[in-house]
Interface confidence: low
C-alpha cells in the first residue's frame, strides 16, 4: 500500500490556469499561472507557456479555453483554432497534437449579440524528457480570461 | 504484477449519470444516479449531488451536460454556465474549479428552431478527504436528460 | 521505483487518429489509424474501428470529432449525434456509453456560410476483456478529417 500511494504521489501531473498575462498578442503560445489558486506542477516543469516533460511516457494532455465576443468582430477570422502543440529538440517546428476549429460567432442570437463558447481538447500522447507542450489559440483576442477556472491547461501521466 | 493490479483496483474512480431526478429546480446542484446502468463509485462516496473524497490526492474530475431547446426561451439567459464546484469544511462558500459559459441558443437555425449543444469540462484538482465536488448548470431548464449517456459526472485519482 | 515505472508501462492505453479511410459511408462506425504519426496501441487491440479490451477494468475513454460544413446541407439532419458505444458478446446490440447531440449548422452566421464545430466526449466506464468500443457520428458526412489531430479516439485504464 505504501508502494501504491507513492506511485500516485510521484505520478507526473499539472494543471495550469489562465491569468491576465496569458494573452501576449505576440503570436506566441498562451502563458499560464503555475502556482497560485488551483494551479500546480508535480513532476513536470514550466517554461514560457510550455509544460516541460521531465519523465518520458504517455500523457493525457488537455486544455480548455473560454471564448466570447459581440457578434463576429471585424479583424477576427470567423474560425477559431485551439490547439495543443509539441516542441521537440529533434525537430525545428512545433508539431500539432490535438486541434479544434470552431465558428463561435454563430452563437450570437438575434436577441443577443453577446456570445460565449468553450473549446475543450484532451488526448493521450507520448512525450520524451525535455519535450514541451504549448497551447495556441488563433485568434487569441476572443479568449476571455477571468479567474483561472474558464481557461486552463494540464497533463498527467497514464 | 499482483501489486500493479491491486493499485488499479483501489484507485478511486466514479462515473455518475443523469437521471429524471437530476434536475431539482431548487437552485441546488444537479443530482446523479450512482448505481444503475453505467454509474459506479469506487473509493469515492456520494451525498446529495456531491462526489465525496475519502482519500486525499489529485483527481481528474469531469462533467458533460446535454443542452437543448427551441429558440431561446424568454426568461432564460442567453448564456448558460456549467461548472464543477468544490465544497470544503474550511470555507463557507462553494469554490469554482472548472467553468464554461456557452450561448447555445445561437445554434438554432433559420430552418429549425430546435437546437442541441453539449458542454464538457475536465481537469485535475487537488482534493482533501471530506471535500465534495458538485455540478451546477444555470439555467438548468436547458439540460436535456435521457438515459445517462448524455449528461454525466465523474472523477478518478491521477 | 522500478515497480512503479513498470506499472505505467503496462497500463493499457491507446490513441487512434482520423484518416482518409475513417469515413466509410456504410453505416458502420468510424475507422481509425493505429500506428502512424500520433497513433498507438499499448495493452489494447484494434479491429474494424473498435478498441478491443484485453484486460478488464475501468477505462477513461474519449473521442473528439471535427465537424464542418457550408450552411446546413439538405438531406442532413440539423442534429449531429457523436457517441461512444460498447459491443459485448453478452448482448446483440451496441450499448450507448457516452453521447452528444449538437446542432452545428447554427454556427453558420448570416455573414459566413462556412462553419466549424468540435465535439468532445470523455468518461470512465467498466470494460471486460473482449469487449469493444466504437465511435459513431450521425451524419458522418459532416466530419472533417485532415491530419489526425482534429478527430481521434482513445482510452486508458484508470
Amino acid at each position: 500500500l505504501i508502494q501504491e500511494r507513492r506511485s500516485h504521489e510521484v505520478n507526473p501531473a499539472a494543471h495550469l490556469t489562465g491569468a491576465n498575462s496569458s494573452l501576449t498578442g505576440s503570436g506566441g503560445p498562451l502563458l499560464w499561472e503555475t502556482q497560485l489558486g488551483l494551479a500546480f506542477l508535480r513532476g513536470l516543469s514550466y517554461h514560457d507557456g510550455a509544460l516541460v516533460v521531465t519523465k518520458a511516457g504517455y500523457y493525457y494532455i488537455y486544455s480548455k479555453v473560454q471564448l466570447g465576443g459581440v457578434g463576429c468582430p471585424l479583424g477576427l477570422a470567423s474560425t477559431i483554432t485551439h490547439g495543443l502543440y509539441k516542441r521537440t529538440p529533434r525537430y525545428p517546428e512545433e508539431l500539432e497534437l490535438l486541434v479544434s476549429q470552431q465558428s463561435p460567432c454563430g452563437r450570437a442570437t438575434s436577441s443577443s449579440r453577446v456570445w460565449w463558447d468553450s473549446s475543450f481538447l484532451g488526448g493521450v500522447v507520448h512525450l520524451e524528457a525535455g519535450e514541451e507542450v504549448v497551447v495556441r489559440v488563433l485568434d487569441e483576442r476572443l479568449v476571455r480570461l477571468r479567474d483561472g477556472t474558464r481557461s486552463y491547461f494540464g497533463a498527467f501521466m497514464v | 504484477l499482483i501489486q500493479e493490479r491491486r493499485s488499479h483496483e483501489v484507485n478511486p474512480a466514479a462515473h455518475l449519470t443523469g437521471a429524471n431526478s437530476s434536475l431539482t429546480g431548487s437552485g441546488g446542484p444537479l443530482l446523479w444516479e450512482t448505481q444503475l446502468g453505467l454509474a459506479f463509485l469506487r473509493g469515492l462516496s456520494y451525498h446529495d449531488g456531491a462526489l465525496v473524497v475519502t482519500k486525499a490526492g489529485y483527481y481528474y474530475i469531469y462533467s458533460k451536460v446535454q443542452l437543448g431547446g427551441v429558440g431561446c426561451p424568454l426568461g432564460l439567459a442567453s448564456t448558460i454556465t456549467h461548472g464543477l464546484y468544490k465544497r470544503t469544511p474550511r470555507y463557507p462558500e462553494e469554490l469554482e474549479l472548472l467553468v464554461s459559459q456557452q450561448s447555445p441558443c445561437g445554434r438554432a437555425t433559420s430552418s429549425s428552431r430546435v437546437w442541441w449543444d453539449s458542454s464538457f469540462l475536465g481537469g485535475v484538482v487537488h482534493l482533501e478527504a471530506g471535500e465534495e465536488v458538485v455540478v451546477r448548470v444555470l439555467d438548468e431548464r436547458l439540460v436535456r436528460l435521457r438515459d445517462g449517456t448524455r449528461s454525466y459526472f465523474g472523477a478518478f485519482m491521477v | 521505483l522500478i515497480q512503479e515505472r513498470r506499472s505505467h508501462e503496462v497500463n493499457p492505453a491507446a490513441h487512434l487518429t482520423g484518416a482518409n479511410s475513417s469515413l466509410t459511408g456504410s453505416g458502420g462506425p468510424l475507422l481509425w489509424e493505429t500506428q502512424l504519426g500520433l497513433a498507438f496501441l499499448r495493452g489494447l487491440s484494434y479491429h474494424d474501428g473498435a478498441l478491443v479490451v484485453t484486460k478488464a477494468g475501468y477505462y477513461y475513454i474519449y473521442s473528439k470529432v471535427q465537424l464542418g460544413g457550408v450552411g446546413c446541407p439538405l438531406g442532413l439532419a440539423s442534429t449531429i449525434t457523436h457517441g461512444l458505444y460498447k459491443r459485448t458478446p453478452r448482448y446483440p446490440e451496441e450499448l450507448e456509453l457516452l453521447v452528444s447531440q449538437q446542432s452545428p449548422c447554427g454556427r453558420a452566421t448570416s455573414s459566413s456560410r462556412v462553419w466549424w464545430d468540435s465535439s468532445f466526449l470523455g468518461g470512465v466506464v467498466h470494460l471486460e476483456a473482449g469487449e469493444e468500443v466504437v465511435v459513431r457520428v450521425l451524419d458522418e458526412r459532416l466530419v472533417r478529417l485532415r491530419d489526425g489531430t482534429r478527430s481521434y479516439f482513445g482510452a486508458f485504464m484508470v
Epitope: 459581440v70 457578434g71 463576429c72 479583424g75 470567423s78 449579440r113 | - | 448570416s110 455573414s111
Partner: antibody, heavy 119, light 109 residues
C-alpha cells in the same frame, strides 16, 4: 426607440485632427458593435472601422490604420471617432452606425456629421 | 478599388421587377447586406443575411445569393424606391467591411 445622435459639423485645417461623437439616445451600445462610415461628396460609402464597447475592442480599415482612433464610453453610451492628419480628400459626411456584429448589417444610422477640410 | 462591384446605374419601369447585383470573391463565403440611400439622408438597411428584412421594410424587397454574386430584387418597383443602393460584406480576408460602389436606381413612368 434608440437613436444615434451625432455631434455637429466641423471645419478643419489640413494636418489637424477631428473628433466626432455619436450618442445612443434612449438605449446603450452594450450588446452591439458601432461602426463608422464616411461618404465624400457625390461618392460612395467607405468603412473606417468599429468598436465593441462591451470588450473595449477596436478594429480599423487598413487604409486608415494609424490615422483613425475609435473609442467608446459605455457609461454615457457614446462612441467617438478621431481622424488625424486631415487632408482635403477627408472632406465627407461621417456616419456612425449600429452594427449587428455577426450580421455585418448596420441597422441603425446617425444622421451624419459633415467634416470639411480646407485651408 | 472596391472588392465589391455594382453596376453604376439601373432603371426600371414603375411596377416592374428589377434586380441589382453585387459581385466579389468574398461573397462566396459571406452574405451581403443592402442599403437604400436617398439624397441628403443616411443609408437605411433593407436586406441582411440570407434574406432578412428589418421591420418596416416592404416585402417587395428580397435578397439572394449565388456563387460570387449577391442580388437585391425589388418586385413591383414604386416611385419611392428611386435611390442609391449599396451592398456591403466582409473583404476576402474576412477581416474588414467593404462596400460596393453603389447603384443608382431610376424608376421610369
Amino acid at each position: 426607440e434608440v437613436q444615434l445622435v451625432q455631434s455637429g459639423a466641423e471645419v478643419k485645417k489640413p494636418g489637424s485632427s477631428v473628433k466626432v461623437s455619436c450618442k445612443a439616445s434612449g438605449g446603450t451600445f452594450s450588446n452591439y458593435a458601432v461602426s463608422w462610415v464616411r461618404q465624400a461628396p457625390g461618392q460612395g460609402l467607405e468603412w473606417l472601422g468599429g468598436i465593441l464597447p462591451i470588450f473595449d475592442t477596436s478594429y480599423y480599415a487598413q487604409k486608415f490604420q494609424g490615422r483613425v482612433t475609435i473609442t467608446a464610453d459605455e457609461s454615457t453610451g457614446t462612441a467617438y471617432m478621431e481622424l488625424s492628419g486631415l487632408r482635403s480628400e477627408d472632406t465627407a459626411v461621417y456616419y456612425c452606425a449600429r452594427d449587428q456584429g455577426f450580421e455585418d448589417a448596420f441597422d441603425l444610422w446617425g444622421r451624419g456629421t459633415m467634416v470639411t477640410v480646407s485651408s | 478599388s472596391s472588392e465589391l462591384t455594382q453596376d453604376p446605374a439601373v432603371s426600371v419601369a414603375l411596377g416592374q421587377t428589377v434586380r441589382i447585383t453585387c459581385q466579389g470573391d468574398s461573397l462566396r463565403s459571406y452574405y451581403a447586406s443592402w442599403y437604400q440611400q436617398k439624397p441628403g439622408q443616411a443609408p437605411v438597411l433593407v436586406i441582411y443575411g440570407k434574406n432578412n428584412r428589418p421591420s418596416g421594410i416592404p416585402d417587395r424587397f428580397s435578397g439572394s445569393s449565388s456563387g460570387n454574386t449577391a442580388s437585391l430584387t425589388i418586385t413591383g418597383a414604386q416611385a419611392e424606391d428611386e435611390a442609391d443602393y449599396y451592398c456591403n460584406s466582409r473583404d476576402s480576408s474576412g477581416n474588414h467591411v467593404v462596400f460596393g460602389g453603389g447603384t443608382k436606381l431610376t424608376v421610369l413612368g
